[in-house]
Interface confidence: low
């Protein structure tokens, strides 16, 4: 049976979803266990012109010392204002000084990056040491690069489409996810549904997705259900500022009781099926419906609270 609920974009003042993911449009992770220099390459596209970026490097200590020196090659397509955090890391940074401006002096060794196309930049980087990771990111707001974490099976890093960078790289896109909403026809009352659908990633290892839900309304005003649907290998850690009904695939736990896993349900894996699930749970409004790539952290801020749905 078709569920009549015409999903339309919701204005950002009614609902916004941001997320952190390891999925990249192109990337690779390789192992270079004996290399003196750990080389990472980032190709960053900023589609709407000048942007600000937080870039954090974290190193895992091995035997109390950083494992090796790091070369980070930063290739950008337009002006970027960079806030770099790389405390205590012996970092060499190669970048285009006419496009990258630092929030504060970087305090690391820097090299001017030649104006090469991507393939030549990879070759240039590989001449300095074996490439541990490379990634192409579209409009990042923040990036976390974990050093000494490479779990790749490759011995040589070659950019491939739709890659999962695992623990090596996590990033947050600047543009929030598209949030849509609709009225479920023929359902009375003020119960609202928040539906989050996480799409399968490139690698299918077990994953926990942390879902932070912040609804700006008084607890007594709220009658809501949170529907979380994802691939079978995804479990959920829920951090919500309101009590609400939970309906998920896989297993879920709450941040306040992380050790208590609760078994979820088998849910439909289509938008139409999930809208039907919301209707079955007596929701009259789908306050937010979001489809995301496989993410590690998802934050939902909404101010619908069973009130009138406003689409943009």
């Amino acid at each position: 049976e078709t569920v009549h609920c015409d999903l339309q974009p919701v204005g950002p003042e009614r609902g916004e979803v941001t997320y952190t993911t390891s999925q990249v449009s192109k990337g690779c992770v390789a192992q270079a266990p004996n290399a003196i220099l750990e080389v990472h390459v980032l190709f960053l596209e900023f589609p709407t012109g000048p942007s600000q970026l937080e870039l954090t490097l974290q190193a895992s200590k091995q035997n109390g010392t950083w494992p090796r020196e790091v070369l980070l090659v930063l290739s950008v397509n337009s002006s970027v204002f960079l806030h770099l955090q790389a405390l205590g890391i012996p970092l060499h940074l190669a970048y285009n000084s006419s496009l990258v401006t630092f929030q504060e002096p970087p305090g690391v060794n820097t090299t001017e990056l030649p104006s090469f196309p991507k393939t030549q930049i990879l070759e240039w980087a590989a001449e300095r040491g074996p490439i541990t990771s490379a990634a192409e990111l579209n409009d990042p707001q923040s990036i976390l690069l974990r050093l000494g974490q490479a779990q790749g099976s490759l011995s040589f890093c070659m950019l491939e489409a739709s890659q999962d960078m695992g623990r090596t790289l996590e990033w947050r896109p600047r543009t929030p996810a598209l949030v849509r909403g609709c009225h479920l026809e023929g359902v009375a009352g003020h119960k609202e549904a928040h539906i989050l659908r996480v799409l399968p990633g490139h690698s299918a290892g077990p994953r926990t997705v942390t879902v932070k839900v912040e609804l700006s309304c008084a607890p007594g005003d709220l009658d809501a259900v949170l529907i979380l649907q994802g691939p079978p290998y995804v479990s959920w850690l829920i951090d919500a500022n309101h009590n609400m009904q939970i309906w998920t695939t896989g297993e879920y736990s709450f941040k306040i009781f992380p050790e208590k896993n609760i078994r979820g349900f088998k849910l439909p894996d289509t938008p139409q099926g999930l809208l039907g699930e919301a209707r079955m749970l007596n929701a009259s409004i789908v306050a937010s419906f979001v489809e995301l790539p496989l993410a590690s952290i998802v934050s939902l801020h909404a101010s619908s609270c069973g009130g009138r749905l406003q689409t943009s």
């Epitope: 709407t48 012109g49 000048p50």
Partner: antibody, heavy 118, light 106 residues
């Protein structure tokens, strides 16, 4: 409500100078990247200059056509951005708009007319 | 610099008709923004990042495109839609505008 109000336009001789001001209100000015865009009569829009926020070290950028002659500056305490125009040429004659860049030019002033003529 | 060429320069149509405005870039750009301007007024943001309508813009407007070819479409012209529309890119320095397309009443 975002408001941008330009002032300081007028008639000036070639080689002369003029300083435009843009008073901003309705948003956190110190966080904003502010630009000047101009438009000659009956012509299209031309980007002129930009000054970024305090967090961006108030970095400035100019179109090639005005580089070395125009200076963009700002006073965050007065919520005002300025365009100092020196060595003016007849081709600088235009309406000058103050605008805010936030992924695109999302707010514009009404413009101030600068006429360079002898 | 990336040159944006808008066509046609003038589009003469009647209310209710469909309008298709083109913006072609001399090199590939990632996104295109569009602004509307009426005589004696400042430009107004209309469509940003290729396909997103700015605040308060009616749904009869839409934007599309990629690479070097971008389009602004008005599904059914209303009297208030007659104006000049400019495209703009900042995928590459410097920021550039197109020359504009004037949509006039036939």
């Amino acid at each position: 409500e975002v408001q941008l109000v330009e002032s300081g336009g007028g008639l000036v001789q070639p080689g002369g100078s003029l300083k435009l001001s843009c008073a901003a209100s309705g948003f956190t000015f110190s966080d904003a990247w502010m630009d000047w865009v101009r438009q000659a009569s009956g012509k299209g829009l031309e980007w002129v200059a930009e000054i970024r926020s305090k967090a961006s070290n108030h970095a400035t950028y100019y179109a090639e056509s005005v580089k070395g002659r125009f200076t963009i500056s700002r006073d965050d305490s007065k919520n005002t951005v300025y365009l100092q125009m020196n060595s003016l040429k007849t081709e600088d004659t235009a309406v000058y708009y103050c605008t805010r860049w936030r992924r695109f030019f999302d707010s514009w002033g009404q413009g101030t007319l600068v006429t360079v003529s002898s | 610099e990336i040159v944006l060429t808008q066509s046609p320069a003038t589009l003469s149509l009647s209310p209710g008709e469909r309008a298709t405005l083109s913006c072609r870039a001399s090199s590939s750009v990632s996104y295109m923004h569009w602004y509307q301007q009426k005589p004696g007024q400042a430009p107004r943001p209309w469509i940003y990042a290729t396909s997103n309508l700015a605040s308060g813009i009616p749904a009869r407007f839409s934007g599309s495109g990629s690479g070097t070819d971008y389009t602004l479409t008005i599904s059914s012209l209303e009297p208030e839609d007659f104006a000049v529309y400019y495209c703009q890119q900042w995928s590459s320095n410097p920021l550039t505008f197109g020359g504009g397309t004037k949509v006039e009443i036939k």
